[in-house]
């Protein structure tokens, strides 16, 4: 809406608000070691952090949610930090005939917002 | 992935997991009474509830996030309940020249998932 402006500066202090963070995970961590061959270690970008009022609001719904959470915190949850976009990843995995490559478009986050 | 299957039954009990809920809000609640004329009361569908392991996972990223949250709960947050789709709503609002109708495509949630 014209009367609610999302903001990009974190009022909680550095690194506390919704942002992208890299998490190292092995195929064993993911439970994929029986079918994915490579890479054996993945750099997984994930969205972490809090979503204070108006911070990186995804859309009008998120702006409203933030406002109503302030009024009815027990009823309406605060917006939360989720991916706004993804970066594709190619994995090598086992097939009946050997090994093949497959792309995953929704595995690694590229950007985050509060929804 | 072929080895992680999202599920639709809530292990926490009825109404506890991620679902759509209607919240009544007035224009005053939203801080819109100075520029929106109608409707004066909005039925806002919002996504509320928890996202236990594999429940209504939005995509591969959400499945992985749930898995890593189980392994590193302090580092990786659990997936959270956000809109998967929206239903458009028309608002009548003031303009410099009088009154106009405007459609908002991202104001009212229509479906929810865990992202």
């Amino acid at each position: 809406s014209a009367h609610l402006h999302p903001r990009d500066s974190c009022p909680l202090g550095p690194g506390r608000c919704c942002h992208l963070e890299t998490v190292q995970a092995t195929l064993e961590d993911l439970g994929w070691s029986d079918w994915v061959l490579s890479p054996r270690q993945l750099q997984l970008s994930m969205c972490v952090g809090e979503c204070p009022h108006l911070y990186r609001s995804a859309n009008t719904h998120a702006l409203i949610k933030a406002r109503l959470h302030g009024l009815q915190p027990d009823r309406v949850p605060a917006p939360c930090c989720v991916p706004s976009s993804y970066t594709p990843v190619v994995l090598m995995h086992r097939t009946d005939s050997g090994v093949s490559l497959q792309t995953y478009d929704d595995l690694v986050a590229q950007g985050c917002h509060c929804a | 992935s072929a080895h992680l299957h999202p599920r639709d039954s809530c292990p926490l009990g009825p109404g506890r997991c991620c679902h759509l809920e209607t919240v009544q809000a007035t224009l005053e609640d939203l801080g819109w009474s100075d520029w929106v004329l109608s409707p004066r009361q909005l039925q806002l569908s919002m996504c509320v509830g928890e996202c236990p392991h594999l429940y209504r996972s939005a995509n591969t990223h959400a499945l992985i996030k749930a898995r890593l949250h189980g392994l590193q709960p302090d580092r990786v947050p659990a997936p959270c309940c956000v809109p998967s789709s929206y239903t458009p709503v028309v608002l009548m609002h003031r303009t410099d020249s009088g009154v106009s109708l405007q459609t908002y495509d991202d104001l009212v949630a229509q479906g929810c998932h865990c992202a």
């Epitope: 061959l37 890479p39 270690q41 090994v99 | -």
Partner: antibody, heavy 119, light 110 residues
């Protein structure tokens, strides 16, 4: 500094075998895939295949399957491309290239190895 | 015949803006990112743009990439003599994995 250094130019006769190399340095060799790309004289780039040097898993382009063999020796951070029986049509520049973090592009390239096959 | 289609050549005068197109399909560019490589005469290709519109460090901001639907384009502004090279787009295709365009020769006039 990331570097891929390839072996020198080769002149061979049809039917002969050949193995060219690509040595990686300045990064963890087993953490990134290595691909091979062919460029015939005056032509464009063609992807031949890829190897994961850590597990030695290989995947070939359908056009090159059965024509070449890709291998790696992680103890000396080197990838290889080999032919058991060369043909005149194998005359080309061959490049090795390292894959970027998520495997969708090539971020570093070797200088190329020119292979000439002529009777 | 390349899976990705590029014009064989483009040209421009120093200081001008030129664009190079790369046309694909729903099985490649339509679903995945496009990358661009520059090959100066007698040298190996070099990564110029990755993931549609990202520049590796060291690549001047005169180079930019974009993607729309099943097509992508590379734009070069403030053309310089040293930009004369072959340019290749590259993506992923579900049937043949990594695919390149046929290449475009950029000539800087004058």
């Amino acid at each position: 500094e990331v570097q891929l250094v390839q072996s020198g130019a080769e002149v061979k006769k049809p039917g002969e075998s050949l193995k060219i190399s690509c040595k990686g340095s300045g990064y963890s060799f087993t953490s990134y895939w290595i691909g091979w790309v062919r460029q015939m004289p005056g032509k464009g780039l063609e992807w031949m295949g890829v190897i994961d040097p850590g597990g030695s898993y290989t995947i070939y382009s359908p056009s090159f399957q059965g024509q070449v063999t890709i291998s790696a020796d992680k103890s000396i951070s080197t990838a290889y491309l080999q032919w058991s029986s060369l043909k005149a049509s194998d005359t080309a520049m061959y490049y090795c290239a390292r894959y970027g973090r998520y495997g969708t592009y090539f971020d570093y390239w070797g200088q190329g190895t020119l292979v000439t096959v002529s009777s | 015949q390349s899976v990705l289609t590029q014009p064989p050549s483009v040209s421009g005068a120093p200081g001008q803006r030129v664009t190079i197109s790369c046309s694909g399909s729903s099985s490649n560019i339509g679903v995945l990112y496009v990358n661009w490589y520059q090959q100066l005469p007698g040298t190996a290709p070099k990564l110029l743009i990755y993931s549609n519109d990202n520049r590796p460090s060291g690549v001047p901001d005169r180079f930019s990439g974009s993607k729309s639907g099943t097509s992508a384009s590379l734009a070069i502004t403030g053309l310089q003599a040293e930009d004369e090279a072959d340019y290749y787009c590259q993506s992923w295709d579900s049937s043949s994995n990594y695919v390149f365009g046929g290449g475009t020769k950029l000539t800087v006039l004058g």
